[in-house]
Interface confidence: medium
């Protein structure tokens, strides 16, 4: 899957502890689950459950594992090559326009509309007009417009795979 990184993701600088495995970089890059040493000579393993890296990289630090917020459930823990996978709790969903928070799903459709899609962790209920069958143009995004992620990775702004 894809990867974008910000300063908030960077783990604090870590000295290479004895338990951290080292290997040599390949073409100046270190494999997933590792970061490069400051002198560029070694690849140092990330610490399981604390930080990770998902792709070949020249990161000076592994990336800090995400902690799921309240209102989210942890689907899978952080490993050295994959961040924590968080998902909105039942009855809530995450929108592309506000990926930082889970929002409550609506309990029903407006008058004159029928429900054709259930609340999921990544989409609100979907409503269509009874007569025309057209989708509601209000808050509810069409299914194909909602935030999703690759197969095996439930939708979450903090989810990724290596």
């Amino acid at each position: 899957e894809s990867a974008l990184i910000t300063q908030q993701d960077l783990a604090p600088q870590q000295r290479a502890a004895p338990q951290q495995k080292r290997s040599s970089p390949s073409e100046g890059l270190c494999p997933p689950g590792h970061h490069i040493s400051e002198d560029g000579r070694d690849c140092i393993s990330c610490k399981y459950g604390q930080d990770y890296s998902t792709h070949w990289n020249d990161l000076l630090f592994c990336l800090r594992c995400t902690r799921c917020d309240s209102g989210e459930v942890e689907l899978s823990p952080c490993t050295t090559t994959r961040n924590t996978v968080c998902q909105c709790e039942e009855g809530t969903f995450r929108e592309e326009d506000s990926p930082e928070m889970c929002r409550k799903c609506r309990t029903g459709c407006p008058r004159g509309m029928v429900k054709v899609g259930d609340c999921t962790p990544w989409s609100d209920i979907e409503c269509v007009h009874k007569e025309s069958g057209t989708k509601h143009s209000g808050e509810v995004p069409a299914v194909e417009e909602t935030v999703t992620s690759s197969p095996g990775t439930p939708a979450s702004p903090c989810s990724l795979s290596g």
Epitope: E1, S2, A3, L4, I5, T6, Q7, Q8, D9, L10, H35, I36, T54, N57, D58, L59, L60, F61, L63, T66, N83, E96, D97, P99, E100, V147, T148, S149, S150, T153, P157, C158, S159, L160
Partner: nanobody, 125 residues
């Protein structure tokens, strides 16, 4: 709102090189993660490379490791992708992407990012 304009695409022979540029307008990119994705005809959009802000390091897909180099010039508000030893399988539309907020964590291609319109790279004999 951020606008991204890619350039530098074109047709090149296998083994050749190209340098893609992505000029951002609307805000300074210095504190934001940026990256490149690509989409080949009939295939899913895939991650190519990403740049951490402030020279914190870079990410590369295994398929481009050692051949592509990502860099950025924060003063010019521009992201680059130097592509060398190009192969037929590198043929794709290349998209520049920037994180929507400084707090946006690592995201998927369908996450909360701004996207450019793309520039076509064709590698053929």
């Amino acid at each position: 709102e951020v606008q991204l304009l890619e350039s530098g695409g074109g047709e090149v022979q296998p083994g050749g090189s190209l340098r893609l540029s992505c000029a951002a307008s609307g805000r300074s990119i210095s504190n934001y993660a940026m990256g490149w994705f690509r989409q080949a005809p009939g295939k899913e959009r895939e991650f190519v490379s990403a740049s951490v802000w402030n020279n914190g390091g870079n990410y590369y897909a295994e398929s481009v490791k050692g051949r592509f180099t990502i860099s950025r010039d924060n003063a010019k508000n521009t992201l680059y992708l130097q592509m060398s030893s190009l192969r037929a399988e590198d043929t794709a539309v290349y998209y520049c992407v920037v994180a929507r907020t400084p707090e946006t964590p690592i995201t998927s291609a369908r996450g909360a990012n701004y996207w450019g319109q793309g520039t076509l790279v064709t590698v053929k004999p």
